[in-house]
């Protein structure tokens, strides 16, 4: 936001170099995606709705975020799972829930896990149940890297803009 | 921190444009609030204690953070809940715990949930119990927007500076 | 990334002040550490492996991150715990799991908890079990401050680069 809240001399500097702040802003890619609530048995990320956005070069392709420029990014994601009363039948074995942010890079021929959270819930013992998972961290990423997610327990997702999301921003 | 760790030529540039770094810093509002431990049955945010702070325009009014300038912010919050051991009832019903960061904006006439986490805990045989919830994400906010929280299970909060907090910073 | 994606006039500005962007980058310390998987009964942080890194002044000493310059930092950490299946006892006592990020500063003669998460798990009928904890927040730190972690339940850690990590970056 060039010129906002600047002292006169700083505002003058910004006028003399009008593109300086703008250039800096172009180096601040950010994205926030939300899980599509209309897709109940898959997790499809959406950027064009509610509070979701893609800024300064981030794009969404094949359900993956494409990293626009090399640098350090903070990457984060959350999911919320739930189960209704008496959903399991003849088992007391736990339900495995997991959510992972993965990196697919030209440097590696496979998906590298960046962030992983896991939970076993015991539907037979605790019904109804609810569980939230969140994680985020800073990573050195390269232009063209693909960030995606993998989730175990998709049928149990609570899909809303404030419960299931995935994002990243350049530091 | 203008001039720290700069090469001679960069330091010279900073001296020529003395407000440039400062101007950039004034565009970096940040806040970190902690739950007031003296208020046991409410969640009141405090900024003037322990590690809490308000910087570069953030203010706290009516238990809400006021967004000082339009832009993208990373918003986060954590709560920890606990329950003490008691004489359990075998058929005790579940306790619903939830924590939400909400946005009140001039654009909407209601509170919009930004971040939501939820949990069912089953007191009884599982006493004592402890549960932590954390979430955070990037949002496009407008000057004057109000960020607040809503919590289900307030009497069970473990109120300390490192367990219950709420914050935001401009990207 | 000086000159990347800049308009001609902004690129010219960057050439006139060649160190300006670089200087800005030197004020962006960041670190991401992962738990050493070869150490099963301790939590030793590593920076020279997998996706881990230390940048712009951060260093790792005595299992602590040393803050390179005063300012506001976002600090974060995650752990994942697990327990394997065994012949269950319904009355087994709870296991206390906790993870804390602590600050040791010249201003205080003791470790100050910055971020704390806690959980009680009940082995027995709930075996196997898995539990994830994450937290992060913004703090005003001083050059020379030491950031470290304390964990209860270390033998139960799931040590992998994507499950157990600790990091910080300057805002």
């Amino acid at each position: 936001l060039p010129g906002v809240g600047l002292t006169p001399s700083a505002a003058q500097t910004a006028r003399q170099h009008p593109k300086m702040h703008l250039a800096h802003s172009t180096l601040k890619p950010a994205a926030h995606l939300i899980g599509d609530p209309s897709k109940q048995n898959s997790l499809l990320w959406r950027a064009n709705t509610d509070r979701a956005f893609l800024q300064d070069g981030f794009s969404l392709s094949n359900n993956s975020l494409l990293v626009p420029t090399s640098g350090i990014y903070f990457v984060y994601s959350q999911v919320v799972f739930s189960g209704k009363a008496y959903s399991p039948k003849a088992t007391s074995s736990p339900l495995y829930l997991a959510h992972e942010v993965q990196l697919f890079s030209s440097q590696y021929p496979f998906h590298v896990p960046l962030l992983s959270s896991q939970k076993m819930v015991y539907p037979g013992l605790q019904e109804p149940w609810l569980h939230s998972m969140y994680h985020g961290a800073a990573f050195q990423l390269t232009q063209g890297d693909q960030l995606s997610t993998h989730t175990d327990g998709i049928p149990h997702l609570v899909l809303s803009p404030s419960t299931v999301f995935f994002g990243a921003f350049a530091l | 921190l203008p001039g720290v760790g700069l090469t001679p030529s960069a330091a010279q540039t900073a001296r020529q444009h003395p407000k440039m770094h400062l101007a950039h810093s004034t565009l970096k509002p940040a806040a970190h609030l902690i739950g007031d431990p003296s208020k046991q049955n409410s969640l009141l945010w405090r900024a003037n204690t322990d590690r809490a702070f308000l910087q570069d325009g953030f203010s706290l009014s009516n238990n809400s953070l006021l967004v000082p300038t339009s832009g993208i912010y990373f918003v986060y919050s954590q709560v920890v809940f606990s329950g003490k051991a008691y004489s359990p009832k075998a058929t005790s019903s579940p306790l619903y715990l939830a924590h939400e960061v909400q946005l009140f904006s001039s654009q909407y006439p209601f509170h919009v949930p930004l971040l939501s986490s939820q949990k069912m805990v089953y007191p009884g045989l599982q006493e004592p119990w402890l549960h932590s919830m954390y979430h955070g994400a990037a949002f496009q906010l407008t000057q004057g927007d109000q960020l607040s929280t809503h919590t289900d299970g307030i009497p069970h909060l473990v109120l300390s500076p490192s367990t219950v907090f709420f914050g935001a910073f401009a990207l | 990334l000086p000159g990347v994606g800049l308009t001609p006039s902004a690129a010219q500005t960057a050439r006139q002040h060649p160190k300006m962007h670089l200087a800005h980058s030197t004020l962006k310390p960041a670190a991401h550490l992962i738990g050493d998987p070869s150490k099963q009964n301790s939590l030793l942080w590593r920076a020279n492996t997998d996706r881990a890194f230390l940048q712009d002044g951060f260093s790792l000493s005595n299992n602590s991150l040393l803050v390179p310059t005063s300012g506001i930092y976002f600090v974060y950490s995650q752990v994942v715990f697990s327990g394997k299946a065994y012949s269950p006892k319904a009355t087994s006592s709870p296991l206390y799991l906790a993870h804390e990020v602590q600050l040791f500063s010249s201003q205080y003669p003791f470790h100050v908890p910055l971020l704390s998460s806690q959980k009680m798990v009940y082995p027995g009928l709930q075996e196997p079990w898995l539990h994830s904890m994450y937290h992060g927040a913004a703090f005003q730190l001083t050059q020379g401050d030491q950031l470290s972690t304390h964990t209860d339940g270390i033998p139960h850690l799931v040590l992998s680069p994507s499950t157990v990590f600790f990091g910080a970056f300057a805002l």
Epitope: S93, Y96, Q126, G153, P155, H156 | A90, T91 | K84
Partner: antibody, heavy 114, light 113 residues
């Protein structure tokens, strides 16, 4: 439609090994445990153990520990049972089941004989 | 291991009869926190896989006729067929899923009289 389909049964020499497959379709595979149950001819049902495909967690009946190994390939929605050092008394129909939803496969017959 | 004992081992009955099969466990299958019994009943016909009839001791699986009912708690459980039909002649098994290893009763064969 949900289906569990076992394969890999047949005649095996004593001391030999078998690898049974259980292909799942019609539901999300990774979060739910796959149980293995066997039934000797004219006898009752015996629980061998179970695997969680997503986490890789396994639980074995002590009777089969060391001889049975469970694995899973999430990309193929398939669970596997490997049994070693087979004896005549291992002759049985082997079933895979998902107790969470109450699904069972049709079973595959393994005959251990020389 | 939890031992499951069914009785009788076999029984002969006619179409329309009320049939009762019992199952006893060597320890309680009741989880007191939620008052659920970790017991299931299966029906198996010759050459076929077992079919789930009842879970949580008394909950009928979808598609199972209402003439099948389960009852009991703790260590004593009963499967009742209120009016035996021709397609009900089969072997019935109880199973506990309270603890590992999961264990089955030895089975009760229901034959035509």
């Amino acid at each position: 439609e949900v289906q569990l389909v076992e394969s890999g049964g047949g005649l095996v020499q004593p001391g030999g090994s078998l690898r049974l497959s259980c292909a799942a379709s019609g539901y999300t595979f990774s979060s739910y445990w796959i149980e293995w149950v066997r039934q000797a001819p004219g006898k009752g049902l015996e629980w061998v153990g179970e695997i969680n495909p997503g986490s890789g967690s396994t639980i074995y009946n002590e009777k089969f520990k060391g001889r049975a190994t469970f694995s899973a390939d999430n990309s193929k929605n398939t669970a596997y049972l490997q049994m070693n050092s087979l004896r005549a008394e291992d002759t049985a129909v082997y079933y895979c089941a998902d107790g969470y939803h109450g699904y069972w496969g049709q079973g595959t017959l393994v005959t251990v004989s020389s | 291991d939890i031992q499951m004992t069914q009785s009788p081992s076999s029984l002969s009955a006619s179409v329309g009869d009320r049939v009762t099969i019992t199952c006893k466990s060597s320890q309680s299958l009741l989880y007191s926190t939620n008052q659920k019994n970790f017991l299931a009943w299966y029906q198996q016909k010759p050459g076929k896989a077992p079919k789930l009839l009842i879970y949580w001791a008394s909950t009928r699986d979808s598609g199972v006729p209402s003439r099948f009912s389960g009852s009991g708690s703790g260590t004593d459980f009963t499967l009742t067929i209120s009016s035996l039909q021709p397609e009900d002649f089969a072997t019935y098994y109880c199973q506990q899923y309270y603890s590992y290893p999961r264990t089955f009763g030895q089975g009760t064969k229901v034959e035509i009289k």
